[in-house]
Interface confidence: low
């Protein structure tokens, strides 16, 4: 806590400007009016305050807004955002995507902090769903964001948002998450033609059921082995040798290199040897 002391004569701040960097902590506390600070928050970032001075400014805002800052202040917090605790952020009601972007920009290039996680959580809950613009923004700053959500949270993602997802945004998703995302992707891309559809759906196929894989095998898609290896084992097991051959096209020869790994290993064990022999790869069931 900063002690309450009277402002020295002539030092009362009329505006938030560069001169304040020479104020001691107690002078900032005594001479800067919290309401003035709130209306001129956009100037704070342009002034090279020390972290200690920023603590004082935060303290003043906390006193002025004990129930949580208004969005007009939040949007201009800039580096002061790094001073906020998750508890502070839980009091906020952030509704503007521009506000979210402004605060994510401050944290850009760093790992997702508890503060950022809380901010995103508040924002998404306030919107009721993870819409396309929000997802676009979040994955731009944090490509792994989507895979940090629980399957329950992912269920609130509307199919239209899937268009914002890039392959690397799914790098760290586990099968349970892909189980939720795949049907949404299927719906989102349903009006695309065969080859375009496959390009878009490919990253989500770790959540595809057997019947969809069978359908893809009829479309001459030439799935690569990396994609095949990420398919659900339970979805691959019922596929026939002929279906896998059609699904993989020229990549079918890659099965030999993967014969000891799931799901290839388990699939081989389910096949009749004379069917496997038709591939000419020396696979042993």
């Amino acid at each position: 806590e900063v002690e309450k002391t009277a402002c020295p004569s002539g030092k009362k701040a009329r505006e938030i400007d560069e001169s304040l960097i020479f104020y001691k902590k107690w002078e900032l506390e005594a001479c800067v009016d919290a309401a003035l600070l709130a209306t001129q928050m956009d100037r704070v970032n342009a002034i090279p305050f020390t972290y200690e001075q920023l603590d004082v400014l935060k303290h003043k805002l906390d006193e002025l807004y004990p129930q949580g800052y208004p969005e007009s202040v939040i949007q201009h917090l800039g580096y002061l955002f790094l001073k906020m605790s998750p508890e502070d952020i839980r009091k906020w009601n952030v509704t503007s995507l521009e506000t979210l972007k402004a605060l994510l920009e401050v944290n850009k290039g760093h790992e997702m902090s508890p503060q950022v996680a809380t901010l995103i959580d508040r924002f998404v809950k306030g919107r009721g769903q993870l819409d396309k613009d929000t997802l676009d923004t979040l994955t731009a700053f944090y490509p792994g964001y989507l895979c940090s959500l629980s399957p329950e949270e992912l269920s609130s993602v509307p199919p239209s948002s899937i268009w914002a997802v890039r392959p690397q945004d799914l790098d760290t998703c586990d099968p349970r998450q892909l189980d939720v995302l795949y049907p949404k992707a299927r719906l989102a891309f349903q009006n695309m033609n065969g080859s375009e559809y496959f390009v878009k759906i490919q990253s989500f196929l770790g959540g595809a059921p057997t019947e969809d894989l069978k359908a893809l095998s009829q479309q001459n898609v030439s799935m690569d082995l990396a994609t095949f290896m990420k398919l659900r084992t339970d979805a691959v097991l019922p596929l026939t040798v002929a279906e896998v051959q059609k699904l993989l096209g020229p990549h079918v020869e890659g099965l030999k290199a993967e014969e000891r790994h799931r799901p290839v290993r388990d699939w081989i064990l389910r096949q009749r040897q004379d069917d496997l022999d038709t591939l000419g790869l020396g696979l042993q069931g």
């Epitope: 997702m112 490509p143 792994g144 690397q168 790098d171 760290t172």
Partner: antibody
Framework: EVQLLESGGGLVQPGGSLRLSCAAS????????MTWVRQAPGKGLEWVSG????????YYAASVKGRFTISRDNSKNTLYLQMNSLRAEDTAVYYC????????????WGQGTLVTVSS | DIQMTQSPSSLSASVGDRVTITCRSS??????LAWYQQKPEKAPQSLIY???SLQSGVPSRFSGSGSGTDFTLTISNLQPEDFATYYC?????????FGGGTKVEIK
Amino acid sequence: EVQLLESGGGLVQPGGSLRLSCAASGLTFRSYAMTWVRQAPGKGLEWVSGISVSGGITYYAASVKGRFTISRDNSKNTLYLQMNSLRAEDTAVYYCAKRGAAVGSFDYWGQGTLVTVSS
Amino acid sequence: DIQMTQSPSSLSASVGDRVTITCRSSQGIGSWLAWYQQKPEKAPQSLIYAASSLQSGVPSRFSGSGSGTDFTLTISNLQPEDFATYYCQQYNSYPLTFGGGTKVEIK
């Protein structure tokens, strides 16, 4: 300070194998996707392989697929590249690089280790 | 695969010059483009990510612009330490691909 230190390079005959390692320090290794990039003598940069945070998802350039295997041990803060069936055209300096937290580009690189494939 | 084409492949310039390097992708990549600087016998260093965002610690004389298929790296006031090779790289989709490089030499 983030540091990535590659090792395991050397001279190997065509058809031989090598295992490269990349020891990471100064970062929460398990939080970042990692990658290998190579540079043949006097040539440009070529992306070789990438691996997700958990190690569960891997990507390969067509030129190495089926011969190279990327892996990671998060408990040892180490990234690996197992190179089999090596060819003369695999001769290069191999760099490991860390993917930025907020982006897919590579913000930190190791100093590189030279792999020479020759008989 | 997405092809990245850099031009010119080399250029000569003097200290204080403004240098512009372009990078074109064979298909749209949004803003998912990075620029790297590499000096002889050294590892590459990140300069720009997301087409225009400056990597921490990189001097402000470096700037990036563009989106879609056409991108530019500009060095506004060339310094002696800037003579190096510059590479662009797309990370919109796998396989990740680099441009062929642009060597900036002393005139």
